[in-house]
């Protein structure tokens, strides 16, 4: 993950361009854990960057991801109360030049190297959960969202409205 | 349907000092963050700074060292503290508030009507 200096860098560079015909309306880090308090982590191995969920060991520091706002160019197709906002959408770059992707063949999330702009399969439409808890859910296929599988990401279909709090889509932003 | 009313803008001379206030009001079940952006005439909106529901903080370069945003949970109200202001600060600066609702856990972006600040001797 990136010290603070690259990301101020890399925060102005993004905020300067153009990413899918709109720029993020807002930007800050945070680390990500899981509902059980596992840190997802990002290890370059062979010229890739890997995903893990673990345990950190004491003091051992959180990488943290860049977490980019979008609002959505088109409203909401939900019924509700009259809400007139738009819907959030996130990207997710824990190191310049690499998001969070969507693999919806192999129903993975993987790191991949993007170039501008990013493909639909970097953005997640954000819910609200329970406990504070955050959920992800692809914008190329409704439906279904980033969890906790084996202690990898992966991409998890989830049926109902009952399931949406099971414990492996449920996420923590944190900024400490 | 949430509401984001602003307060505190006016007209200020350089140097001086200002503090806005945005009050977040309706449905709300969950507010994720709160910002301020501003627009000057002529020019794009852009962001000025935002804190987030863990009290994490982003400031852009322009303002850093004279802004302090802060908020009150309890109140979903943001404020922002302007000091040593600059003529370059004359924007109309809008609150943003991202917020899930009760009913959809689909968090949403809300926007004041912005409140005008004008930094001139």
């Known amino acids: 993950a990136f010290g603070i200096s690259g990301v101020q860098k890399y925060t102005r560079a993004l905020h300067d361009s153009s990413i899918t015909g709109i720029s993020p309306i807002t930007e800050y880090l945070a680390s990500l854990s899981t509902y059980n308090d596992q840190s997802i982590t990002f290890a370059l191995e062979d010229e890739s960057y890997e995903i893990y969920v673990e345990d950190l060991k004491k003091d051992e520091k959180k990488d943290k991801v860049l977490l980019s706002y979008y609002e959505s160019q088109h409203p909401s197709n939900e019924s509700g109360d009259g809400v007139d906002g738009k819907m959030l959408m996130v990207t997710l770059s824990p190191t310049k030049d690499f998001w969070l992707h969507a693999n919806n063949k192999e129903h993975s999330v993987e790191l991949h190297k993007c170039e501008k702009p990013l493909p639909d399969q970097a953005f997640f439409v954000l819910h609200n959960m329970h406990s504070n808890c955050v959920s992800f859910e692809c914008k190329t296929d409704p439906g279904v969202f980033i969890g906790v599988k084996d202690n990898h990401l992966a991409l998890i279909k989830v049926d109902s409205s009952e399931n949406l709090c099971t414990e492996n889509i449920l996420f923590k932003l944190s900024e400490t | 349907q949430v509401q984001l009313v602003e307060s505190g803008g006016g007209l200020v001379q350089p140097g001086g000092s200002l503090r806005l206030s945005c009050a977040a009001s309706g449905s709300i079940r969950t507010v994720n963050y709160m910002g301020w952006h501003r627009q000057a005439p002529g020019k794009q909106r852009e962001l000025v700074a935002v804190v987030t529901s863990g009290g994490g903080t982003n400031y852009a370069d322009s303002v850093k060292g004279r802004f302090t945003i802060s908020r009150d949970n309890t109140k979903n109200t943001v404020y922002l503290q302007m000091n040593s202001l600059r003529a370059e600060d004359t924007a109309v600066y809008y609150c943003?508030?991202?917020?899930?609702?009760?009913?959809?856990?689909?968090?949403?972006?809300?926007w004041g009507q912005g409140t005008l600040v004008t930094v001139s001797s």
């Open positions: 943003n508030a991202a917020a899930s609702t009760y009913s959809s856990t689909v968090v949403r972006s809300f």
